[in-house]
């Protein structure tokens, strides 16, 4: 039941995460214009991965795509790359991880195999989370260095420019909702690998042998024995089937027909 | 980086016109200028986006007109009856996936 429960939350948590990545890939607000000590007094800019917005002063805003690597920083690219990987992991990892789902019947799937798949589907959103976190990252650290440079730039009028004519850029919504999606999809990702172990199969059977001493001679016993993960309740060795032998707490020193040859 | 190049500055007398144009490197997502005149705050003249809509400063109303071309990697300002108040170093603004300045140009009309 637990097993089920964290399986099914594990599951609708990176759901609930992957949306979010593909929400924050999408959105527009992945940089806004900063507002203090704004040059620009008549519009108000921020950019997405894909397109970049302009809001004037009457409310109108006009949003155009990038239609050229031209004058767009490197780094863009391989923010984006990592977004879309993080996506397609994630819907992978949702498509593997419903066909895993302990209450969803399919066939004569054996547990052995629907805990694999979940395993798989649980690293699949582990990396599709941090897919996610590092392109969010990648760009919030590309948008700091930015700002202080553009800060260094007002103050020092760097290269030229004249002093207040700089724009600066901070932290837009995108970003949160990249991070918190991503994380979401990671802690989703590690339910569904705590869940695998639950799946997985706890005993395995295997032949023993038992040697005990029965008054001058050995008695070889061959017996069927249940060994144990630790995580099952078989931790006194029972037997599974009686093949003559016995545990060692039901051992007895009296002799038996077979004990003299 | 998107690189902006601008011309058509210099002296005039009042009365007179002056064309100004911001080349950019690339195709622009809105352009504009705004000037800066000896010990006064910087203020907008007027910009222009990619569809054409433009925006302009209630002092230059009626006399200055912004236009593009059609790729947007040119934008002009179109400035007539020139007024000794706009004497000013005018800068271009380019914004594309960040905002792009010049180093300016200077506008100087004598009365």
């Known amino acids: 039941m637990a097993v089920t429960a964290c399986q099914g939350l594990g599951f609708v948590v990176s759901l609930i995460g992957i949306a979010g990545i593909i929400a924050a890939t999408c959105m527009d607000q992945w940089s806004t214009q900063d507002l203090y000590n704004n040059p620009v007094t008549a519009v108000f800019n921020y950019q997405g991965l894909w397109r970049s917005c302009v809001r004037e002063s009457s409310g109108f805003t006009e949003c155009r795509g990038y239609f050229t690597l031209l004058g767009l920083p490197a780094m863009l690219q391989a923010v984006r790359a990592l977004m879309i990987v993080g996506i397609v992991l994630g819907a992978i990892g949702l498509l593997v991880s419903i066909f895993a789902l302990k209450c969803i019947r399919i066939g004569s799937m054996e547990d052995s195999a629907k805990a694999n798949m979940t395993l798989t589907s649980g690293i699949m959103f582990i990396v599709s989370g941090l897919c996610a976190i590092a392109g969010v990252s990648v760009f919030a650290n590309m948008l700091v260095t930015n700002f202080w440079m553009s800060t260094a730039n007002m103050y020092t009028g760097m290269g030229g420019m004249v002093q207040t004519v700089q724009t600066r850029y901070t932290f837009g919504a995108a970003l949160f909702v990249g991070w918190v999606a991503g994380g979401l999809t990671l802690i989703g990702g590690v339910m569904m690998c705590i869940a695998c172990r639950g799946l997985a199969p706890e005993e395995t059977n295997y032949k023993a042998v038992s040697y005990h001493a029965s008054g001058h001679s050995v008695a070889y016993k061959p017996g069927g024995f249940k060994a144990s993960t630790g995580f099952g309740s078989n931790t006194k060795n029972k037997k599974i089937y009686d093949g003559g032998a016995r545990t060692e707490d039901e051992v007895q020193s009296y002799p038996s027909k077979h004990d003299y040859v | 980086d998107v690189q902006l190049v601008e011309s058509g500055g210099g002296l005039v007398q009042a009365g007179g016109s002056l064309r100004l144009s911001c080349a950019a490197s690339v195709g622009i997502f809105m352009g504009g200028w705004y000037r800066q005149a000896p010990g006064k705050q910087r203020e907008l003249v007027a910009t222009?986006?990619?569809?054409?809509?433009?925006n302009y400063a209630d002092s230059v109303k009626g006399r200055f007109t912004i236009s593009g071309d059609n790729s947007m990697n040119t934008v002009y300002l179109q400035m007539n009856s020139l007024k000794p108040e706009d004497t000013a170093v005018y800068y271009c603004y380019a914004h594309y996936w960040r905002d792009y300045w010049g180093r300016g140009t200077q506008v100087t009309v004598s009365s």
């Open positions: 222009i986006s990619s569809s054409g809509r433009t």
